[in-house]
Every structure is written in structure tokens, then in C-alpha cells.
Amino acid sequence: LEASEEVELEPCLAPSLEQQEQELTVALGQPVRLCCGRAERGGHWYKEGSRLAPAGRVRGWRGRLEIASFLPEDAGRYLCLARGSMIVLQNLTLITGDSLTSSNDDEDPKSHRDPSNRHSYPQQAPYWTHPQRMEKKLHAVPAGNTVKFRCPAAGNPTPTIRWLKDGQAFHGENRIGGIRLRHQHWSLVMESVVPSDRGTYTCLVENAVGSIRYNYLLDVLERSPHRPILQAGLPANTTAVVGSDVELLCKVYSDAQPHIQWLKHIVINGSSFGADGFPYVQVLKTADINSSEVEVLYLRNVSAEDAGEYTCLAGNSIGLSYQSAWLTVLPEEDPTWTAAAPEARYTD
């Protein structure tokens, strides 16, 4: 929605008694006008348990919810209850436009209650406010990573949250590094997870009316030391025409810091191998993985002399891996000629 547009649910007609929970995203500064029930007999609007006054920047008036200019603190849950009864006519959550795209999902709107307001809506058992943030149930996380579980909920009275691990109360006292419980964000954070953190994490959300629970299943994957893994098929055999540019690609995966070299196989005194049995090579490029574009070997304006075998060699503290490919260079005048190159080699 553009900031200039007004958010409207529908004209103030007779209410639907099958009003489903809705979520509306509103841009900051945008006016909001939501209706509930007929104008004269419109319902009462409540925000986070407090009845809205008929005057002010955010007001509930003759069945209408009106916000002159939407601000971050206006985000939250709004209910419209029928006059003279506890029937919910509207049940919706307003979200600030940024909050859906923000990568920091900690910024949940806080409840803004007016303690002097005595018109509170009826008691309600806990319910999940953002179930879409809880959809990922099974977690497989490498050791050392940070894990965050969230169970955003609401209810009236405001529910409390407790965490269990494998069915037992969990406060993190036996965990190196402890845990961070952020009750206002309904979250549990564990930094630098280790295998002993594996298990079932249950958030238990309770108030006087009822309780709900949700399980997260956590697996911690041990980092098994291995030498670099090179993606199969890379570098690939390549055919190029004299004068063209060539790129050879090598994809390297390694937990331990890898070191990469690009080598060209050369012939010395008519031989490709030295007395030690190793091939003669010329080092074309060498760097660590975090160097920019180290995994690509660029050959500019290739000539017939550039033809031959090229090797991507990757090593770390555990060992070496390499894969090779052939570059065939065709003369400019006869681009239809092709030569069968040997298959690329893949070694462990």
C-alpha cells in the first residue's frame, strides 16, 4: 500500500459474525479507517485489552477505528466487540510496513495499555499471534551457531511463558554460556550450541484461562573435520577460440580455512612428469578462500599456447583435494573443428 492510501476494511454495514482473524500491514504515516457494525450501533474497539476512547489520534467512535497517521506504537492487536455483548465482530492485527521485511523480528509491537481505562475486553486463553514464525519445527544447526526459538503469544490476562527442555523446566543454569530469555519477545536464545543442547524445547504459554504449548526439535551437527570438498564437474572442460576470454570455475567447500591454487600443467624437456612422479605445473593464482574471486581463473585473449590441462588445488589443515579440466583452443579461421578432450578428473 502506498503511504497516501487509506486502509479500509469495509463500509460500516451489519457485522459478519464469522469474522476471522486478519493481519493488515500498514505503512508508517498512513491513515487507517476500519469499520465494525452499523454506524449507530457499531461495536466498541479495544487495543491490547484497553477500550479506545472516542477522541484522540487513535480513536474508536461509532463503530469506527480511526488512526490519523499510523505510527510504530499503533501496531498491535485490535478487537471490536458488539455493544451489550461479548461477541467479537473484528479481530485483527496491525503490523507496521517495515516489520514484515525487517530481518530483526525482535521488534514486536509492545502493548500500550492505559491503566486508568476500566473497559477491558473479556478474558481470553492464550493464542499464537504469529504462527508463521513458528512453522519451522525441526532444526539442524552446526555446532557453534546461535539458535533462537520464538513463541509469540497473547491473551487476557497477558500470559506468561516458560521453557522446557525434554519435558523438564529449562533455565540454562547447566549450560555453558547460559541462555537468554526475552519474555517481551517470547524468545529463547542459545549461543554457541553444542551437542548436549540437542533435544526438544517446549514453550509453555499460560494464563488464568488456559495454556498452549509448542515443541521445537533441535539437532546440533558436529563439524567433522575434512579436507576441502570440490563441487563435481568443476572446473569443466572448455573449448574456446583464439583471442576469446575464458573463465574456469572451481567451487570449494571447507569448514577449516582453505587455501586455493590454480595450476597449469606444463611440459619440460618433453616430459609432463618429474622424476618424483609429480606433474610439472606452473602456479597461475594462489589465495585464501576469502579473497575475491579466487574460485575463478580468468584467461584473457587466449592463444594456442594456453591450451592444456588446468587444475584447481584446494588444501586445508586436514588435507588436499584437486580437480582438473582441459582447455581446447581452436584457430579463429576454423571454428567448426573440435577436438575430443580427455574427461575431467575428479579425485577425493
Epitope: W128, P131, M134, E135, K136, K137, L138, H139, A140, G167, P195, R198, G199, T200, T202, I212, R213, Y214, N215, L217, L218, D219, V220, L221, E222
Partner: antibody, heavy 118, light 112 residues
Framework: EVQLLESGGGLVQPGGSLRLSCAAS????????MSWVRQAPGKGLEWVSA????????YYADSVKGRFTISRDNSKNTLYLQMNSLRAEDTAVYYC???????????WGQGTLVTVSS | QSVLTQPPSASGTPGQRVTISCSGS????????VNWYQQLPGTAPKLLIY???QRPSGVPDRFSGSKSGTSASLAISGLRSEDEADYYC?????????????FGGGTKLTVL
């Protein structure tokens, strides 16, 4: 391409034991949650057990708790189900399935039939 | 008896729209996403819908899923003879006994 191939089914007497295997390929087995689901002849699907990628966490249906054990050998890309104290009601086709992070079984094996009968 | 409740059978004629319901409780469908599986005669089940309404690649958009509260439904529009199969809903259950997967009893869909 993800492939799951069950084996080890057969006829066994009540009170007997059987071990099912599921050979996996086409994905990083050691990171994947895996599960067993069974289907009695002419009946619906019933979840049996699940295991985390590391093997450090296991889960069971109440109907098999204490009798069945799920395990895995990541070096062999193989999932197992050790079934002890078998009963007639354990007769079913047993499917091996990969669990995705949202909790769904996104790939299934073709199943292996276990018959418990005297 | 299955934890999730489905009608045992459903039917429709080619081209019709058919809906299959799945009812649960707050500890399963109410808190967890719903998945749907199709089992063609004599074959293994296949994932049809995950995360309430998401289709895996290769599943036609004639199949759609939805969830509201503690119930879910699978809709099949433009019914075809090859849709004749058993359909199962499933969800994780977070009851006091610990996590478990629960299935519906299955709905046998007949294309008339």
C-alpha cells in the same frame, strides 16, 4: 535425486524381532531428520518413529515405545528400525521417509512388508 | 481411532471441485502446520501440500490447502480420473506426551 530403499521385512512370529533398513542416497543424509511410518493392510498411515540427523534425538509413537528402536549409521547412509516383542497389530508395510524442517515427509521409500503371525 | 478426523470417503465427477476436511485440536493443527499426502492405489504416499497451503514442485495448482483454527481442508478443482486415491492429512502434535506426528484416518476419493 532423493532415493530411499527399505529392506528387511518378512514373516515373524509374535514376540519375535526384526530389523528394517533404509538405504538413502541423493542428499546429505547426516543432516536429515528421518522417520518410519507404517500402514496396516487396508488401513491408514501411522507414524512410528523419528530420529535427528546426528542420531542424538529420537521420538516414538506410544504404540511402539519400549519395543522399537530407531537408529542410523551416517557413514553408511542407512536408517534402521529394530523391532522387538512384535505383535500381530504390528503387521504393516513400513515406509522410510525423510522429514523436512517444516515437519512434512517430503520423500518416501517404496515400503517393506512386515507380517507378524504364528 | 485417528487423532485427526477426516471423512472416510468423498466423490465427484470430472471437472468438479471437491473438498476434504481435517479436524484436530489445539495441540496439533491449532499449533502446527498441516501437510497432505496422496496415496495412489498400490503406491507409497506422496507429499501433496505442506505448510498448510504450499505445493511441492510438480504438484498441479488444482490442489490447494487451507487452515483455520484447529481445522484444515484440501481442495481439488478440475477433478480428473487420476486424482482417484487416498488422501491423508497430518500434523505434529505437541501434547504432554512429547512431540509426535498424527495422521487423519484418510479419505478415499472416487472420481465418478
Amino acid at each position: 535425486e532423493v532415493q530411499l530403499l527399505e529392506s528387511g521385512g518378512g514373516l515373524v512370529q509374535p514376540g519375535g524381532s526384526l530389523r528394517l533398513s533404509c538405504a538413502a542416497s541423493g542428499f546429505t543424509f547426516s543432516k536429515a531428520w528421518m522417520s518410519w511410518v507404517r500402514q496396516a493392510p487396508g488401513k491408514g498411515l501411522e507414524w512410528v518413529s523419528a530420529i535427528s540427523g546426528s542420531g542424538g534425538s529420537t521420538y516414538y509413537a506410544d504404540s511402539v515405545k519400549g519395543r522399537f528402536t530407531i537408529s542410523r549409521d551416517n557413514s553408511k547412509n542407512t536408517l534402521y528400525l529394530q523391532m522387538n516383542s512384535l505383535r500381530a497389530e504390528d503387521t504393516a508395510v513400513y515406509y522410510c521417509a525423510r522429514l523436512y524442517s517444516y515437519g512434512d515427509f517430503d520423500h518416501w521409500g517404496q515400503g517393506t512388508l512386515v507380517t507378524v503371525s504364528s | 481411532q485417528s487423532v485427526l478426523t477426516q471423512p472416510p470417503s468423498a466423490s465427484g465427477t470430472p471437472g468438479q471441485r471437491v473438498t476434504i476436511s481435517c479436524s484436530g485440536s489445539s495441540s496439533n493443527i491449532g499449533s502446527n502446520t498441516v501437510n497432505w499426502y496422496q496415496q495412489l492405489p498400490g503406491t507409497a504416499p506422496k507429499l501433496l501440500i505442506y505448510r498448510n497451503n504450499q505445493r511441492p514442485s510438480g504438484v498441479p495448482d488444482r490442489f490447494s490447502g487451507s487452515k483455520s483454527g484447529t481445522s484444515a481442508s484440501l481442495a481439488i478443482s478440475g477433478l480428473r480420473s487420476e486424482d482417484e486415491a487416498d488422501y491423508y492429512c497430518a500434523a505434529w502434535d505437541d501434547s504432554l506426551n512429547g512431540p509426535a506426528v498424527v495422521f487423519g484416518g484418510g479419505t478415499k476419493l472416487t472420481v465418478l
